[in-house]
Interface confidence: medium
């Protein structure tokens, strides 16, 4: 058999026996085009690609709309994937999406949706989500159905007001919604009663801004 | 009665690297948040690092990134700052300052501070 | 970066007079603002926290207001250790100064 040297996702990566977390250069479906992602292949059984990570505040996440679609900042720490790659991807096969939580005080939650995928640009990066479970509320934190993906010089929220000029980043805003892992990143002791930080309203409330985030995603049939 | 006394400092060439420490008496340093704050000559004031009481915690100034590391000592009651990849614009007065309680950032108390002089 | 900026630059009283400074912040803070006395070769001395709570051992005629972007410290009646550069600072998103207000006796 033919080696692998392309892979679509870390859970094609880590199938090949590559199962040592780190930055990997993964291929758009159907294209050449190559990006390079962070792949923990240790939590839950591995495969992950991790497409946001907030860690530190060391990234400005409040970014335009082509920044969001193509990436920002370093995949060793806080960054974005990309909407254009993670839609095409997530179009392509079933994937699964987990987000990870830490607060300041040294507590840890997830939620897990079984199904996720990005519509288009041309449907402004609409996230779709379903099937609910973990231990960072009962509740889904990310509005549903699904909305627009909105920055600061693409608004397509539901508000009148401009959410992500209003809590900064680009994120699935209503109007403007319960969460908000793209906010302003705020250090300890500074990170209470801050409307416009890194939000999950049913696991912390709408003022807790959180220490640190992790998005990933991979195929359900893992 | 709380006091701080600064030392370490001097002249340094570009590049060079100095050791800053603090000596803190008057209070339990393990207690507190605790931060190094410079001033240019004939300058404002402008915080450089901070970092949590059991050092789990550190945050530093974006333009100091990478080269200078807060660090702490509680059984020896001591606050450093290590500089390395020194510049002119590090030229300043450090100084090591309190955090108060419950409010990171808000400096109840500050040492005399110890002049940096980075020139060739 | 919260940039907060201060006015005037130097202000020129006589002692037993009333002296007012200015801060404001580029951005909301709250009121997450501290004022600071600073005296030539000494450190900085905190005066103020929370826009208008005074520190341990400040006198009374040192009062502070404001919320949100703009800020104002107020010295009642100017004595002679008044004079002094004073700065304002948030703590309210990461941590900066204003570039000062010196006092001098006009």
């Known amino acids: 058999k033919e080696e692998q040297t392309t892979f679509r996702d870390c859970a094609e990566i880590f199938k090949s026996g590559l199962t040592t977390s780190g930055i990997y250069t993964l291929t758009f479906p159907n294209s050449t085009e190559e990006i390079k992602a962070y792949c923990d292949m240790e939590a839950g059984g591995g495969g992950w690609t991790i497409i946001q990570r907030r860690e530190d505040g060391s990234v400005d996440f409040q970014r335009t709309w082509k920044e969001y679609k193509v990436g920002f900042g370093n995949p060793s720490g806080e960054y974005w994937l990309g909407n254009e790659f993670v839609s095409q991807l997530t179009n392509q096969q079933r994937y699964v999406l987990k987000i990870h939580l830490k607060d300041w005080e040294g507590n840890e939650a997830y939620s897990l949706y079984e199904h996720f995928y990005l519509s288009s640009e041309e449907l402004n990066y609409r996230i779709h989500l379903k099937g609910l479970t973990g231990t960072a509320g009962k509740i889904s934190s990310i509005s549903q159905p699904g909305n627009d993906f909105s920055t600061k010089d693409g608004d397509n929220d539901k508000c009148i007001c401009k959410c992500s000029q209003m809590l900064t980043g680009g994120w699935w805003f209503d109007a403007c919604g319960p969460s908000n892992l793209n906010g302003m990143y705020y250090p300890q002791r500074q990170n209470t009663n801050k409307f416009n930080g890194i939000k999950w309203y049913y696991w912390k409330g709408s003022g807790y801004s959180l220490k640190a985030t992790t998005m990933m995603i991979r195929p359900a049939d893992f | 009665e709380v006091q701080m006394v600064e030392s370490g400092g001097g002249l340094v060439q570009p590049g060079g690297s100095l050791r800053l420490s603090c000596a803190a008496s008057g209070f339990t340093l393990r207690s507190y948040w605790m931060s190094w704050v410079r001033q240019a000559p004939g300058k404002g004031l402008e915080w450089v690092a901070n970092i949590k009481e059991d050092g789990s915690e550190k945050y530093h100034v974006d333009s100091v990134k990478g080269r200078f590391t807060i660090s702490r000592d509680n059984a020896e009651n001591s606050l450093f700052l290590q500089m390395s990849s020194l510049r002119a614009e590090d030229t300043a007065v450090y100084y090591c300052?309190?955090?108060?309680?419950?409010?990171?950032?808000?400096?109840?108390?500050w040492g005399q501070g110890t002049l940096v002089t980075v020139s060739s | 970066e919260i940039v907060m900026t201060q006015s005037p630059a130097t202000l020129s009283v006589s002692p037993g007079e009333r002296a007012i400074l200015s801060c404001r912040a580029s951005q909301s803070i709250s009121s997450n603002l501290a004022w600071y006395q600073q005296k030539p070769g000494q450190a900085p001395r905190l005066l103020i926290y929370g826009a208008s709570t005074r520190a341990t051992g400040i006198p009374a005629r040192f009062s502070g207001s404001g919320s949100g972007t703009e800020f104002t410290l107020t010295i009642s009646s100017l004595q002679s250790e008044d004079f002094a550069v004073y700065y304002c600072q948030q703590y309210n998103y990461w941590w900066t100064f204003g570039q000062g207000t010196k006092v001098e006796i006009k």
């Open positions: 300052a309190r955090d108060m309680e419950a409010s990171a950032g808000l400096f109840d108390y």
